[in-house]
Interface confidence: low
Amino acid sequence: LPAQVAFTPYAPEPGSTCRLREYYDQTAQMCCSKCSPGQHAKVFCTKTSDTVCDSCEDSTYTQLWNWVPECLSCGSRCSSDQVETQACTREQNRICTCRPGWYCALSKQEGCRLCAPLRKCRPGFGVARPGTETSDVVCKPCAPGTFSNTTSSTDICRPHQICNVVAIPGNASMDAVCTSTSPTRSMAPGAVHLPQPVSTRSQHTQPTPEPSTAPSTSFLLPMGPSPPAEGSTGD
């Protein structure tokens, strides 16, 4: 004969546990129903009556099957440097993440507690490591043969243009200036040039090109295979 299905509340067999979505009530010494997400236990079970559940009030939630007497309070409204990526509902907490151009300086279990602006790299510096949701931008000086003339969180060091005749040599914060004849090579519009690494993890760096030579743009990325986003550091 098939085993008889027990309805909550029921006394568990010695040594056995309650079923999924049930909990053992120490006072009643019975297996009782949990409340579903979005609800909480309004009245705990007894030997003869099951748990009575009620919906969470506004601005409170429960995310899991539970038997808590009160729902959890949703987190405070998102601050001005954050955006609400998940609203407060009866079944989930509000989640705040940093708005574009900011990163999470202090995270919490879900979302971010404290956002900070991504730093901007000053002229002469380019982004060596782009910012992520949880890490700030890292700037590095432009190596000889490269330059950045902006204060930006998205600009990397770019190679100097190569002139037939140089009017003003380039430096770390300024491109070379050619005489009226056109340069032999200049940056193609929209071309991505990776920054010369100031130091590379676990690798020797090749000799740095002199400013008068075309800089090499082939090197091992300090962060792995994905190309870095363009430069940034905040003052």
Epitope: A105, C121, T132, C139, P141, A143, A172, T200, T205, T233
Partner: antibody
């Protein structure tokens, strides 16, 4: 007030490893990198490596095979470990804050911890 | 590795005298940094990005240079300037220091 303080063993046996902790205050390791530099009478100031604010380390090629640097942001501590020490590793070991924001200078230094490698 | 050669290794100057020390790089660098160190003390940042004075550094100090040749100048030597000065670059890995110029007061 920005401060860095190194704590190390003082004396290390040859072929053993050296572990130093740099405890920082007045700033967050999530915003600044930390360098390790040593100074010995024979070799002057010598850069060993650093750990960036994002947690990734850079090592001097001369030490990469026996050096590791990591950190615990929540404890504001940076951990330096060098293996296979020899007598010429005797030096004062410093940690110094890196200005990741663009000036790119070691703007604050610890007081240094003296390490002697001897049996 | 970029080698930085500082000269002179040792120099002395009288109060009020102009002092210049140099740092020569084995290949071109974008910027030079200078640190001051006194006996039994940690190095202190002194000049960054070639010519910028670190916080608290007297205006009598200046830095200049480009490419492979850099210098630190004191317009008028004072007793408190007696120290060892190290140049440093980080254009390529590894970051390197010069061997230092020890400046004494006459």
């Amino acid at each position: 007030e920005v401060q860095l303080q190194e704590s190390g063993p003082g004396l290390v046996q040859p072929s053993q490893s050296l572990s130093i902790t740099c405890t920082v205050s007045g700033f967050s390791l999530t915003s600044y990198g930390v360098h390790w530099v040593r100074q010995s009478p024979g070799k002057g100031l010598e850069w060993l490596g650093l750990i960036w604010s994002d947690g990734s380390p850079d090592y001097s090629a001369a030490f990469i095979s026996r050096l590791s640097i990591n950190k615990d942001n929540s404890k504001s501590q940076v951990f330096f470990k060098m293996n296979s020490l020899q007598a010429d590793d005797t030096a004062i070991y410093y940690c110094a804050r890196n200005d990741d924001g663009g000036d790119y200078v070691m703007d604050y230094w610890g007081q240094g911890t003296t390490v002697t490698v001897s049996s | 590795e970029i080698v930085l050669t500082q000269s002179p290794a040792l120099m002395s100057a009288s109060p009020g005298e102009k002092v210049t020390m140099t740092c020569s790089a084995s290949s071109s660098v974008s910027y030079m940094y200078w640190y001051q160190q006194k006996p039994r003390s940690s190095p202190k940042p002194w000049i960054y990005l070639t010519s910028n004075l670190a916080s608290g550094v007297p205006a009598r100090f200046s830095g200049s240079g480009s490419g492979t040749s850099y210098s630190l100048t004191i317009s008028s030597m004072e007793a408190e300037d007696a120290a060892t000065y190290y140049c440093q670059q980080w254009t390529s890995n590894p970051l390197t220091f010069g061997a230092g110029t020890k400046l004494e007061i006459k």
